[in-house]
């Protein structure tokens, strides 16, 4: 058993049929010595008396808010949560496996630049009695500070019969050094509590590996005289690291119709303009990627050919 | 070339060669990008590689003030990786695929380090840790880790030379 926060404790249980469970001793936070009784949750049934209560925690029925009283007055609370371990593996029931970029990916994180600011998000089908708490650091043995905000519900979507909820959090490295080569990964730890179930999820990454620039901005077209060709120009996204002579992007320019199966024109360039062939009912799209490190491409920025 | 007196390197040549190094580092093992090597433990194996750190003057302001500190750091890293790629970690079993770009990568690391340091002048170089994995699978894992680390190192070096070529070239 360990303390998650004041008056909230996590009991780690090996979860299998007829498991013996864990013996837990609760102590009432009071100078009083006698006349103390214990109850669980809303029940008025007295579970025991005395300054300490010894319980065998085997299942969720044994978890909850234990309260010690004296003469009708509440002295203190201890909330017990369960953390299940099945076949040596901690449960991951609360969050959905996003399976990208690999199986058992519960947390996904992205950064728009090298400033040390990043966003992580996760998915769940649970709508109520759910809380998250996020901590982060650079490195684990001698951790350097990363400050995370509160996790918020950022999107809801329907998936078949189920509703899916996306939560996200923004974090900022306290002393970021955008130009340096990272040697210690960022660690992100999410505590998830659903009713009386506790789970924790972690992710470890270098900012450079989660970079995904915003799409290029200000796409403009200039038809070339006596030609089917069009000069398309764009600018670096505002959120990208500066100076651009140091933090350079490379671009992919594509002309394609509405269907992915349609024919296309495609060209890669390090410049902020390119000449392509425009077709009726097609769109010109441009996306960006770090020029020197193969992290994710941005989403496409698009303008219609006409 | 970056010489003791602090004269400028051939920024544009360095830029071209460092960009080539980036391409080669990724083609040497693109799949490395999909392996989460941190899960494999054994962190100390690549902890000894020289990293371009915050105080090394490789940021735009540091380069403007005095690019020598940064160039020396890059040179150290190039020599370090060049020796690693020539060591039995890469030459031993399992043999590299014949079409592996590691050979080109090795040659390009040497080429860029020579651009930075002409004959006759020697910056101090970092000791190569004695990494001699006994098992072929350990060697394979170590190769992946070294290449992954090299990808990050050459990316920073390429940014430095691109910025230098754009803003510091005479």
């Amino acid at each position: 058993i360990w303390e998650l926060k004041k008056d909230v404790y996590v009991v780690e249980l090996d979860w299998y049929p007829d498991a013996p469970g864990e013996m837990v001793v609760l102590t009432c936070d009071t100078p009083e010595e006698d006349g103390i009784t214990w109850t669980l949750d809303q029940s008025s049934e007295v579970l025991g008396s005395g300054k300490t209560l010894t319980i065998q925690v085997k299942e969720f029925g044994d978890a909850g808010q234990y309260t010690c009283h004296k003469g009708g007055e509440v002295l203190s609370h201890s909330l017990l949560l369960l953390h299940k371990k099945e076949d040596g593996i901690w449960s991951t029931d609360i969050l959905k496996d996003q399976k990208e970029p690999k199986n058992k990916t519960f947390l996904r994180c992205e950064a728009k630049n090298y400033s040390g600011r990043f966003t992580c998000w996760w998915l769940t089908t649970i709508s109520t009695d759910l809380t998250f708490s996020v901590k982060s650091s650079r490195g684990s043995s001698d951790p350097q500070g990363v400050t995370c905000g509160a996790a918020t519900l950022s999107a809801e979507r329907v998936r078949g019969d189920n509703k899916e909820y996306e939560y996200s959090v923004e974090c900022q490295e306290d002393s970021a050094c955008p130009a340096a080569e990272e040697s210690l990964p960022i660690e992100v730890m999410v505590d998830a509590v659903h009713k009386l179930k506790y789970e924790n999820y972690t992710s470890s990454f270098f900012i450079r590996d989660i970079i995904k620039p915003d799409p290029p901005k200000n796409l403009q077209l200039k038809p070339l005289k006596n030609s089917r060709q069009v000069e398309v120009s764009w600018e670096y996204p505002d959120t990208w690291s500066t100076p651009h002579s140091y933090f350079s992007l490379t671009f992919c320019v594509q002309v394609q119709g509405k269907s992915k199966r349609e024919k296309k024109d495609r060209v890669f360039t390090d410049k902020t303009s390119a000449t392509v062939i425009c077709r009726k009912n097609a769109s010109i799209s441009v996306r960006a990627q770090d020029r020197y490190y193969s992290s994710s491409w941005s989403e496409w920025a698009s303008v219609p050919c006409s | 070339r970056a010489v003791p007196g602090g004269s400028s390197p051939a920024w544009t040549q360095c830029q071209q060669l460092s960009q080539k190094l980036c391409t080669l580092a990724w083609s040497a093992h693109p799949l490395v990008g999909h392996m989460d090597l941190r899960e494999e433990g054994d962190e100390e194996t690549t902890n000894d590689v020289p990293h371009i750190q915050c105080g090394d003057g490789c940021d735009p302001q540091g380069l403007r003030d005095n690019s020598q500190f940064c160039l020396q750091r890059i040179h150290q890293g190039l020599i370090f990786y060049e020796k690693l790629l020539g060591s039995d970690i890469f030459t031993g079993e399992p043999s590299l695929l014949p079409d592996s770009p590691v050979g080109q990568l090795h040659a390009s690391l040497l080429g860029l380090s020579q651009l930075l340091q002409p004959e006759g002048h020697h910056w101090e170089t970092q000791q190569i840790p004695s990494l001699s994995p006994s098992q072929p699978w350990q060697r394979l894992l170590l190769r992946f880790k070294i290449l992954r680390s090299l990808q990050a190192f050459v990316a920073v070096a390429a940014r430095v030379f691109a910025h230098g070529a754009a803003t510091l070239s005479p």
Partner: antibody
């Protein structure tokens, strides 16, 4: 499978014109760009231009501008390349080539030998 | 127009050996570079597109790398059917241009 079959060899006199055909099969004709590339005997490859069979749009290499015309007949899934004012240095194998991507060549015809000789 | 230069013009290699073919562009073309193989009396065949992307059906011994102005086609272990002429082609801008070719012959 995607296939391009070209017309047979031609012998022409200097100053004449030649029209080479390229019949496509195995795909929807308008779904691919069509290019013409030529190769003089013992020489390398030279791109002449492209046509979009969907709308007849063309782009020719400057070297051939004014002397070449590329057309298509969607009813027969056939592309044509006409080269006028032939000279002896136009002697070459003429290939049609196609792709969904405009700028490189995925599928090639077998080639048509055009000999220009007096 | 962009001029593509291939070297060497002829490469003599023994079967089973590795062949490295070079292609240089007269200006930076990013990764807009494609490789073709042509055997005598046949049309060219696409091997690699956008510098390093492999084509299904093309043996894995063919690989491409490079960006900017310098590109390489590597044939890891030459088979008898690989002796042919290899062309690079840039697609950075029109007109599309090819290199002069590298003939890979049996040593």
């Amino acid at each position: 499978q995607v296939q391009l079959v070209q017309s047979g060899a031609e012998v022409k006199k200097p100053g004449a014109s030649v029209k080479v055909s390229c019949k496509a099969s195995g795909y929807t004709f308008t779904d691919y760009y069509l290019h013409w590339v030529r190769q003089a005997p013992g020489q390398g490859l030279e791109w002449m231009g492209w046509i979009d069979p969907e709308n007849g749009d063309t782009e020719y290499a400057p070297k051939f501008q004014g002397r070449v015309t590329m057309t298509t007949d969607t009813s027969t899934s056939t592309a044509y390349m006409e080269l006028r004012s032939l000279r002896s240095d136009d002697t070459a194998v003429y290939y049609c080539a196609a792709n969904k991507e405009l700028r490189y060549f995925d599928v090639w015809g077998q080639g048509t030998m055009v000999t220009v000789s007096s | 127009e962009i001029v593509m230069t291939q070297s060497p013009a002829t490469l003599s290699v023994s079967p089973g050996e590795r062949a490295t073919l070079s292609c240089r562009a007269s200006q930076s073309i990013s990764i807009n570079l494609h490789w073709y193989q042509q055997k005598p009396g046949q049309a060219p065949r696409l091997l690699i597109y956008f510098a390093s992307q492999s084509i299904s059906g093309i043996p894995a011994r063919f690989s491409g790398s490079g960006s900017g102005t310098e590109f390489t086609l590597t044939i890891s272990s030459l088979q008898s059917e690989d002796f042919a002429v290899y062309y690079c082609q840039q697609s950075n801008s029109f007109p599309l241009t090819f290199g002069g070719g590298t003939k890979v012959e049996i040593k």
